[in-house]
């Protein structure tokens, strides 16, 4: 063991040391005094340090704890929130454009539809919103609620347009006809399919998001124990109170000590990893039906499709309603029935499609990425912290809590802080009730993500195939064959290049087809941050 | 005293290279994210680039992405902007800037509170 | 061209209040802080204000930042002919995952 450095006769420097910390010097002792009262700078021999000096210590120590802790946390927490405010925004810009490419379908190709089709339109795509802000609204009833108020306009506008006004009290009849007798085909039914999985799906990402924010909030702010702020000042403070004002602590004492104030943040770490994992399964599942961007996006072609199949079987469907509406109805009027030969060959057409270059699916692998270099965040905490405080490298001539040592010894640092005060004890008290709750909070959330109907390798191309999204052939069913058809094939490009997008909105004068596209451009996620800057020079 | 310092401006031709250095000291520098922000005679700024204070995570503006890359070590504290494929439009005072990040809630500021005092990069012919 | 809009000019006569706009979109003023930074003719950039309307030590009073959704704002009052300077706002975008700045306001004290 070196020879004690010779003591500091008159405090000064320990004097000048606290002054910063704490304005004016009557706590500070002008010589060396026995210190008998001291409760946790225990000392060997004449000590620079009163009570008030410990206590104020003690406070200083626990703040610096929390800000190391807030600035160990800051790069994710940005990352998180940036994030977050972007999907929420790009989702709301996806939502805008699906019902303003559904609008333009509607205005090119059925103008006479346009007056009510919006209203139904703007309604349905107002519940995709709600829906997908956590509101408690079906899906399915959504969808219902759309082709039960378009069938009736459909019918009275295109199928029976010299329909008197007289007779226009058949709407309700109309709208009960229209799940009767499937007047849209299996339309509806392939909507929902879409519709509420990707929203779903859409939903409980942001859900997820929104928690990884409430996670870091909470472990960002946790209030230390009066114990781990006498750990902390032993650690950072009590070598002053024998004028060694230079010596800095043993890295593994600070482990050591890190590991005690922690223990019940670092119970998060379990749950947090299976949060990440669970996150990187659903968006690696957030493709074709499970992707709100690809579904919503080309919705307007499915809805197309849907009134051309009643077009199509506009002459057997006036016949049945007019019986089945005839105490609203008088007569039949003049069918306005399409004939077969002014439909293009099923066989030909393909799916609109989102061309995902780099769009929101790009930018949800590349967060996953980033929070993937985040998986043992709070396992790592302790080792984080104890590197960004000053800590003695290679375990040598350090301050082991009691004395300056040539080298550290775990074993009988650990002695010296039993005698002090139980580390176990510390141990064993268990999280905080706040980690408690944001633990039960990620489990839950875990839970949700586990239980995800999401696709497993190939059977998601086996559903499709049930389910009718496949683009390129149709099935044996041809009149359920989805293609986009009238003013042929439109290809939808993405139109999420996000800067380009956030705040802006396309015109219903803009056709899908013939509006001008933005390029997507690479999206890089960003994660600056200030770690350590625990005495900021800003106010 | 809080200091940064640029270094390694000059004339260079089109499609040429230049390595802009910033040599820090005051302050811990391991501890700080760092940008590069420029600035056209004339002009208003524009950030360039920016690191992480590990040098693990780099980010750019599109105008730079694929020609120039940021760099730093920690151990001599000072930043490195490697600048290739340089064009005349890349003409600027180059400043090297201390960045801040706080976020409280679901709310967050990134500023730059250290600047130097700037290199110029002229890119001619 | 910017993604944050600032007027051109600004002026104003000694121990005038001034104010100088900022406009931006919800990716960045909309969901992140702003800050504003003084230059001075033939200098480096200085932060003025960061976090909306925080002061770093050796500011004087006198600048002052607020926000508004998407909008923010920078007021010097009892303006000075050293205050004679470009003014820059400046924030995080997270759609671009990159800062932004103002095209810089050049004021003007008569």
């Known amino acids: 063991q070196p020879p004690p450095p010779p003591p500091d006769a008159t405090c000064h420097q320990v004097r000048s040391f606290f002054q910063r910390l704490q304005p004016g010097l009557k706590w500070v002792p002008e010589t060396p005094v026995p210190g008998s009262d001291l409760q946790v700078c225990l000392p060997k021999g004449p000590t620079c340090c009163s009570r008030k000096m410990e206590e104020k210590y003690q406070l200083t120590a626990r703040l610096n704890m929390e800000q190391l802790l807030q600035s160990a946390s800051m790069e994710l927490k940005f990352l998180i929130i940036q994030n977050a405010a972007v999907f929420q925004e790009a989702f709301e810009i996806v939502v805008r454009h699906a019902k303003n490419y559904t609008n333009a379908m509607f205005k090119n190709n059925y103008p006479s539809l346009t007056p009510q089709a919006f209203e139904f339109v703007g309604e349905f795509f107002t519940d995709v919103s709600l829906y997908i802000l956590g509101s408690d609204i079906n899906v399915d009833d959504m969808v219902n609620e759309l082709f039960d108020s378009l069938f009736p306009v459909i019918y009275t506008q295109l199928m029976n347009p010299g329909l008197p006004d007289s007779a226009l009290d058949i709407n309700e009849c109309l709208r009960g006809a229209r799940r009767d007798l499937k007047v849209f085909g299996n339309f509806p039914k392939l909507i929902m399919t879409q519709v509420s999985k990707s929203l779903q799906v859409t939903r409980i990402f942001l859900q997820a998001l929104n928690l990884g924010i409430e996670v870091i909030n909470t472990t960002d702010h946790l209030k230390f124990s009066k114990d781990c702020g006498r750990m902390l000042t032993r650690m950072w403070y009590c070598s002053y109170c024998q004028g060694l004002m230079m010596v800095k602590p043993c890295g593994g004492y600070c482990n050591v000590v890190m590991q005690g104030c922690m223990a019940g943040v670092v119970e998060i770490d379990k749950y947090w990893r299976e949060y990440i994992l669970s996150l990187e399964e659903l968006v690696n599942g957030m493709y074709r039906i499970y992707d709100m961007e690809n579904v919503l996006l080309g919705l307007f072609s499915t809805i197309h499709d849907s009134i051309q199949y009643v077009q199509k079987n506009a002459g057997k469907l006036t016949t049945t309603i007019g019986k089945l509406c005839a105490h609203s109805q008088q007569r039949q009027y003049r069918s306005a029935y399409y004939p077969e030969d002014l439909f293009i060959d099923k066989k030909v057409l393909k799916v609109a499609h989102v061309e995902h270059e780099e769009t929101l699916s790009s930018r949800r692998r590349e967060l996953i990425q980033k929070l993937k270099s985040f998986i043992s965040f709070y396992s790592a905490l302790p080792g984080y912290i104890c590197s960004h405080s000053p800590v003695a490298e290679n375990d040598t001539l350090c301050w082991n809590g009691q004395e300056l040592v040539e080298r550290y010894s775990q074993k009988a640092a650990r002695n010296g802080m039993k005698n002090q005060f139980n580390l176990h004890e510390l141990k064993m008290k268990g999280p905080e009730p706040v980690v408690s709750q944001i633990i039960d909070k990620l489990k839950h959330i875990n839970q949700l993500l586990r239980t995800m109907s999401m696709p497993k390798g190939r059977v998601l191309d086996k559903n499709l195939d049930e389910e009718g999204f496949e683009s390129g052939d149709c099935g044996d069913d041809e009149d359920e064959c989805i293609g986009g058809s009238g003013d042929g094939m439109i290809k939808v490009k993405n139109q999420l290049r996000f800067l380009a997008e956030l705040a802006y909105d396309l015109d219903v004068d803009d056709a899908p087809g013939n509006s001008q596209q933005a390029t997507p451009k690479d999206n890089e996620i960003s994660t600056f941050h200030n770690l350590g800057n625990v005495h900021s020079p800003l106010k | 005293e809080v200091q940064l310092l640029e270094s390694g401006g000059g004339l260079v031709q089109p499609g040429g290279s230049l390595r802009l250095s910033c040599a820090a000291s005051?302050?811990?520098?391991?501890?700080?994210?760092m940008s590069w922000v420029r600035q056209a005679p004339g002009k208003g700024l524009e950030w360039v680039s920016g690191?992480?204070?590990?040098?693990?995570?780099?980010y750019y503006a599109d105008s730079v992405k694929g020609r120039f890359t940021i760099s730093r070590d920690n151990s001599k504290n000072t930043l490195y902007l490697q600048m290739n494929s340089l064009r005349a439009e890349d003409t600027a005072v180059y400043y090297c800037?201390?960045?801040?990040?706080?976020?409280?809630?679901?709310?967050?500021?990134?500023?730059?509170?250290?600047w130097g005092q700037g290199t110029l990069v002229t890119v001619s012919s | 061209q910017s993604v944050l809009t600032q007027p051109p000019s600004a002026s104003g006569t000694p121990g005038q209040r001034v104010t100088i706009s900022c406009t931006g979109s919800?990716?960045?003023?909309?969901?992140?802080?702003v800050n504003w930074y003084q230059q001075l003719p033939g200098t480096a950039p200085k932060l003025l204000i960061y976090?909306?309307?925080k002061r770093p030590s050796g500011v004087p009073d006198r600048f002052s930042g607020s926000k508004s959704g998407t909008s923010a704002s920078l007021a010097i009052s009892g303006l000075r002919s050293e205050d004679e300077a470009d003014y820059y706002c400046?924030?995080?975008?997270?759609?671009?995952?990159?800062?932004?700045f103002g095209g810089g306001t050049k004021l003007t004290v008569l």
């Open positions: 976090a909306d309307s």
């Open positions: 800037a201390r960045a801040l990040l706080g976020c409280k809630s679901a709310y967050c500021y990134y500023a730059m509170d250290v």
């Open positions: 005051g302050f811990t520098f391991s501890s700080y994210s």
């Open positions: 690191i992480s204070p590990s040098g693990g995570n780099k």
């Open positions: 919800s990716s960045n003023i909309g969901s992140n802080a």
């Open positions: 400046g924030s995080w975008d997270s759609s671009l995952s990159g800062y932004v």
